[in-house]
């Protein structure tokens, strides 16, 4: 069987939801010594980056300027060390936002509820769309989808303090082209005293998985790598 290197990790820097005409940055984290990284869009080659010097950095950043609906979709990356290629990374969905109009978001029965009450978010957008998306700030990967002509419902079930936080909704024209975000609606859940200390607070930082962790190799890392190599040989 054909030998391949481990698959790289693909990430969006700061967020995978990029306003139209703004720049998107995707990171491909592979391995030290990789001489070439390729970014693929919808299965086709989109961009190539060659790190300098390759042995000193474990990945690259791909900058996608002037985001639009034609550049929104599924991205993946691969890398090469010598003649050997890696497996393809997982797919990353890159979304363009701020298309067309702004939806409105309301919550029922209201923004202040008690633990155990059932909550429903309602998102409305008058322009033609059929899919609506609800996101909790700090949890932007946990997208809820709902369908409707001009508005959609997002039933939450009986809530706990874990549901508290700020929510926004989008109208979606396709999977990768979203409207402007609605104004945020802050849900406050009281009660559920035994869980209060464990309840998440509103994160003011971006999602932790939406950061690029590319590192430059230091002398210490080289020493550790050499020590690890020696230890492996001793074990053999």
């Amino acid at each position: 069987p054909k030998q391949t290197l481990p698959k790289p990790i693909i990430r969006a820097e700061s967020t995978y939801m990029v306003p139209k005409e703004k720049q998107a940055t995707l990171c491909c984290q592979g391995s030290y010594g990789a001489v070439e990284y390729q970014l693929h869009f919808e299965g086709s080659l989109f961009a190539v980056e060659r790190p300098k010097p390759p042995e000193r950095i474990n990945g690259v950043k791909f900058h996608i300027p002037d985001m639009n609906s034609r550049k929104a979709g599924r991205y993946s990356c691969i890398y090469r060390v010598g003649e050997l290629w890696s497996e393809r990374s997982d797919l990353l969905d890159l979304v363009v936002t701020e298309m067309y109009d702004t939806p409105t978001l309301s919550v029922h029965p209201g923004p202040e509820v008690t633990s155990g009450e059932k909550v429903t978010f309602y998102c409305r957008l008058d322009t033609a769309t059929s899919m609506f998306l609800l996101l909790k700030e700090g949890r932007s990967r946990d997208v809820q989808r709902s369908y409707g002509k001009v508005q959609a419902e997002f039933p939450m079930g009986p809530v706990t303090t874990a549901h508290r936080g700020s929510y926004r909704c989008f109208g979606s024209y396709n999977n990768y082209a979203w409207s402007f975000p609605s104004e945020p609606v802050k849900l406050l859940v009281t009660g559920d005293i035994e869980n209060t200390s464990l309840a998440p607070t509103d994160p003011t930082f971006p999602d932790s998985w939406d950061t690029c962790l590319l590192t430059r190799e230091t002398g210490l890392q080289k020493d550790l790598a050499l020590w690890d190599h020696t230890a492996q040989n001793l074990l053999r």
């Epitope: 409105t104 029922h108 209201g110 008690t114 633990s115 009450e117 059932k118 309602y122 409305r124």
Partner: antibody, heavy 115, light 107 residues
Framework: QVQLQQPGAELVKPGASVKLSCKAS????????MNWVKQRPGQGLEWIGM????????NYNEKFKSQATLTVDKSSSTAYMQLSSLTSEDSAVYYC????????WGQGTTLTVSS | DIQMTQSPSSLSASLGERVTLTCRAS??????LNWLQQEPDGTIKRLIY???SLDSGVPKRFSGSRSGSDYSLTISSLESEDFVDYYC?????????FGSGTKLEIK
């Protein structure tokens, strides 16, 4: 204090339409859902629908969807319900009630449909 | 639609007596249940929201509780003004639905 003012009575002919009003005061009108509820003489309560004045989001009971239209006028803090193609079955008391939890209720408007 | 089965439909009781009204929900409604009081002139007032929270200004003799899908309103010691109609209301899932009502009469 929160108040929801409704006209005491309306008399209309069968086949006509009527627009019932509910004037809110004592709170921020655009911050709360407004519900409409029907009660026929000697009967129980039926939810017609609700509207959020801030977003114009509406939600109707399917039973009333073709007949009732909910609107608001933010400038006067007034919610409206238009009922069309009226029959004697629509003779009832109609209440408006604030909030998703129905915390404050109007006094109700008695609608009589009669020729 | 969620059915709210309210019982009893009428109840005769004496001043000072303790009474309990019940509503059974046909589907899960969590704690999204109100108890309403309707005067003979049609005035409607909310007594209890979120199953067990007492509205401000409502006497402490009124209390709400839940056991599974059964929701109860208890009046610990009846007073003369309590002899009116009572309704439960679920606001968990639209269409929001009411119980058929309980007429509380003086014995």
């Amino acid at each position: 204090q929160v108040q929801l003012q409704q006209p005491g009575a309306e008399l209309v002919k069968p086949g006509a339409s009527v627009k019932l009003s509910c004037k809110a005061s004592g709170y921020t009108f655009t911050s709360y859902w407004m519900n409409w509820v029907k009660q026929r003489p000697g009967q129980g309560l039926e939810w017609i629908g609700m509207i959020h004045p801030n977003s114009d989001i509406t939600n109707y009971n399917e039973k009333f969807k073709s007949q009732a239209t909910l609107t608001v006028d933010k400038s006067s803090s007034t919610a409206y319900m238009q009922l069309s193609s009226l029959t004697s079955e629509d003779s009832a008391v109609y209440y408006c009630a604030r909030h998703g939890r129905f915390d404050y209720w109007g006094q109700g408007t008695t609608l009589t449909v009669s020729s | 639609d969620i059915q709210m089965t309210q019982s009893p439909s009428s109840l005769s009781a004496s001043l000072g007596e303790r009474v309990t009204l019940t509503c059974r929900a046909s589907q899960d409604i969590g704690s999204s249940l109100n108890w309403l009081q309707q005067e003979p002139d049609g005035t409607i007032k909310r007594l209890i929201y979120a199953t067990s929270s007492l509205d401000s200004g409502v006497p402490k003799r009124f209390s709400g509780s839940r056991s599974g899908s059964d929701y109860s309103l208890t009046i610990s010691s009846l007073e003369s003004e309590d002899f009116v109609d009572y309704y439960c209301l679920q606001y968990a899932s639209s269409p929001f639905t009411f119980g058929s009502g309980t007429k509380l009469e003086i014995k």
